[in-house]
């Protein structure tokens, strides 16, 4: 049945409005012409005032924000939770990779510990920081690891007669490490694998975090005055006539929402592309593009690189003996 | 060959030699995330319709509000929506997105470009140079297993993916996500007491 005729005393309108704005006498006692109204233009007497219109416009914008937040809740939850899971999972991978590498040193080259532990620790700390977006160069990280390791390998394994903490010779050995390609092509191999896998991991996390930012931005959009007026007409102007339970016509709602969201809908094209590009990236995250695979295998490649040094130990010791003779003499004097 | 580091770990269970069916791995989790994200691919284009369907609009009522008056739901007046004298909808659309939306579009463009740059072209997962440098030994790679360790005695075949998700304290079943709607059919004269905003029938 049609709703009852508008309240002759505006009493019910007052009751409803009072919940939004308690204590203020903004509601007329009886219906008025409403000639000052700008949004809820009346066809006859109305129970609304200009102040009420303003309150309804504020309410309309708040309600729209609530509706947007409710619309995006599931999507937001999905991305936030996954971003957290992947970040933690990547940290676990790094922790395991570090442990594996330390264990490899402890079991195979006990004489290199604890210095090796320190260098390995620094390397994997940098790996973690890089994934989280730090401005670190992966090649530098790998070079630093091998630059630090070689003096220890040389002084502990290849030439154990040298006094410890020979700073001068350490510097010379660091330089010789690169010039003589002491570890063969292993450092380059590690650089390629680590940089490719970490780049992909980093961009994956960056993309998830941007996804959260996109949803957060649209969640808290401030809608234009025109949109606020349109929403007010659709949702609240009926109250001015004492019609609290009537609902907007479906087509009318669609037109209003399309008008209000014309700008937001422009995100659509780029959002689609974002999901499809992310899918492409994920499809390629295997073998050397999978940090899990690369980092958990690092201990083995490092082990091979040390074996390579040992295999060429005799030749290397002679060459380095000549190359770094000056440093050694200074030290013995 | 490397003596495989076993004695240091409490979590030796992570290193599985046998292939475990349905094991949840990072790569499977990534694929699962993408599948779920793809169900939101039309999120922004569908938003106006979604909001209308999740706020009260006249469905079963004979009368509805068109912005100015109460009208028959299927009448001309319902379609005209009472807006003609008030706001120029075309003008509203022509204004273009507001600065924050433009900013977010720029950020999306940027990340999309990065993602495309980083995406591995099909069939090019391994660079030739790496092949030559002996990254792949050739005899390790069935399913998701890879060789960790150098060739020769003592090679250990290890499950490629860590079973992290046992370690992670998250349960990401989105069916339990807060805000998940129960899209039950609303019978006439009944209310589904859900928590969507504007929860009237």
């Amino acid at each position: 049945q049609p709703p009852p005729p508008p309240d002759a005393t505006c009493h019910q309108v007052r009751s409803f409005f009072q919940r939004l704005q308690p204590g203020l006498k903004w509601v007329p006692e009886t219906p008025v012409p409403g000639s000052d109204l700008q949004v809820c233009l009346p066809k006859g007497p109305t129970c609304c005032s200009r102040k009420m219109e303003e309150k309804y416009q504020l309410t309309a914008r708040l309600n729209m924000e609530q509706l947007l937040q409710s619309a995006s809740m599931e999507l937001k939850f999905l991305i936030i939770q996954n971003a957290a899971v992947f970040q933690e999972a990547f940290e676990i991978v790094v922790r395991h990779a570090k442990n594996y590498t330390n264990a490899m040193f402890k079991n195979n080259y006990p004489s290199l510990t604890p210095q090796a532990f320190e260098f390995v620790g620094e390397f994997f700390t940098d790996v973690s920081l890089y994934i989280l977006g730090s401005d670190i160069n992966v090649d530098d990280m790998v070079n630093e690891l091998f630059d630090s390791l070689f003096p220890v390998i040389y002084t502990q394994m290849m030439n154990p007669g040298l006094p410890e903490s020979v700073l001068d010779i350490n510097e010379c050995l660091r330089g010789a490490r690169r010039d003589l390609k002491v570890f063969g092509s292993f450092p380059k191999l590690i650089m390629t694998q680590v940089s490719k896998s970490l780049q992909v991991t980093r961009i994956f996390l960056q993309a998830l975090n941007l996804g959260i930012e996109v949803i957060n931005t649209t969640d808290h959009l401030k809608f234009s005055k025109d949109c606020g007026r349109m929403l007010t007409r659709m949702w609240y102007c009926s109250y001015c006539q004492g019609l609290m339970m009537v609902k907007p016509c479906g087509g009318y709602c669609n037109v209003v929402m399309q008008g209000c969201m014309a700008g937001v809908v422009e995100i659509d094209k780029y959002w689609r592309e974002y999901i499809l590009s992310l899918e492409e990236l994920v499809n390629g995250m295997y073998r050397i593009y999978d940090m899990e695979n690369v980092l958990l295998g690092l201990f083995s490649t490092i082990h091979d690189s040390i074996q390579y040094v040992q295999k060429n130990g005799g030749k290397l010791t002679t060459t380095i003996g000549k190359l770094c003779a000056h440093s050694q003499q200074r030290q013995y004097r | 060959s490397a003596y495989y580091p076993e004695d240091l770990f409490i979590d030796k269970k992570i290193l599985k030699v046998a292939h475990v069916e349905h094991e949840e791995t990072l790569s499977s989790r990534r694929r699962e995330l993408i599948q779920k994200l793809k169900s939101f691919i039309n999120f922004y284009s569908a938003l106006p319709g979604y909001i209308c369907s999740h706020s009260p609009v006249a469905e079963n009522d004979t009368l509805c509000w068109n912005g100015q008056e109460l009208v028959e739901r299927y009448s001309q007046k319902a379609a005209r929506n009472g807006m003609k004298n008030q706001f120029n909808l075309h003008e509203l659309k022509m204004k273009g997105p507001e600065p924050v939306v433009s900013q977010i579009i720029d950020k999306l463009k940027h990340i999309n470009q990065l993602l495309r740059t980083m995406s591995v072209p099909k069939g090019k997962v391994l660079d030739k140079s790496l092949d030559e440098e002996g990254l792949e030994s050739g005899d390790c790679g069935d399913d998701e297993d890879e060789c960790i360790g150098s060739s020769g005695d003592g090679m250990v075949k290890v499950k490629n993916q860590l079973r992290f998700l046992a370690e992670l304290a998250y349960d990401l079943d989105v069916d339990d996500a807060p805000g998940n709607k129960q899209h039950g059919n609303q019978k006439d004269n009944e209310i589904t007491t859900s928590h969507s905003v504007g929860n009237m029938p």
Partner: antibody
């Protein structure tokens, strides 16, 4: 599904105050309206007042005006009702209830109730 | 001030019988804003009917509401043992904002 969990029973001396809490879970707390209703032993239901957290605006029944304060904390999804200058006739079960709303305007029906605080 | 008067105070019926509960307002009430609640001993009230005649989810169809103006009725067509409770009507929109009837047991 929305649930309202109320604080535990209280015993107070005449003249003192009591503050009862009502924590909501599920749904969007800020867009609810929350009402407080009390029931004296063997008596009927009596509306005390209500609040819409998103606005922070509270309404009170004339009878309790000046003696009751209803507040809400959006960050913890909790509504509070404080009653001061307690008298023996304030002995009752105090319920919080979520009101239905349409576009943030409460429609007066209370569809989800807490278990009550004595 | 709007008051709601419920009658009878107590109603004793057997399972399968029809129960008719009345709620009368001192002023005309919009049927959109009249509700019925059920309260069992030791429990919180439960919303049964809103807008005078609309059932909420999960409420059996043996419960129905009707009426307008000042006279409203809750009918339970075939009583079940679990329907034993106190029933309250409630209005919204007139001073005081919310008013409950005194209840029918």
């Amino acid at each position: 599904e929305v649930q309202l969990v109320q604080s535990g029973a209280e015993v107070k001396k005449p003249g003192s105050s009591v503050k009862v809490s009502c924590k909501a879970s599920g749904g969007t707390f800020s867009s609810y309206a929350i009402s407080w209703v009390r029931q004296a032993p063997g008596q009927g239901l009596e509306w005390m007042g209500g609040i819409i957290p998103i606005f922070g605006t509270a309404n009170y029944a004339q009878k309790f005006q000046g003696r009751v304060t209803i507040t809400a904390d959006k960050s913890t999804s909790t509504a509070y009702m404080e009653l001061s200058s307690l008298r023996s006739e304030d002995t009752a079960v105090y319920y919080c209830a979520r009101e239905w709303q349409q576009q943030l305007v409460p429609l007066g029906y209370m569809d989800v109730w807490g278990k009550g605080t004595t | 001030e709007t008051t709601l008067t419920q009658s009878p105070g107590t109603l004793s019926l057997s399972p399968g019988e029809r129960a008719t509960l009345s709620c009368r307002a001192s002023h005309s009430v919009s049927s959109n804003f009249l509700a019925w609640y059920q309260q069992k001993p030791g429990q919180a009230p439960r919303l049964l009917i809103y807008a005078a005649s609309s059932r909420t989810t999960g409420v059996p169809d043996r419960f129905s509401g009707s009426g307008s103006g000042t006279d409203f009725t809750l009918t339970i067509s075939r009583l079940e043992p679990e329907d034993s409770a106190v029933y309250y009507c409630q209005q919204y929109g007139y001073s005081p904002l919310y008013t409950f009837g005194q209840g029918t047991k």
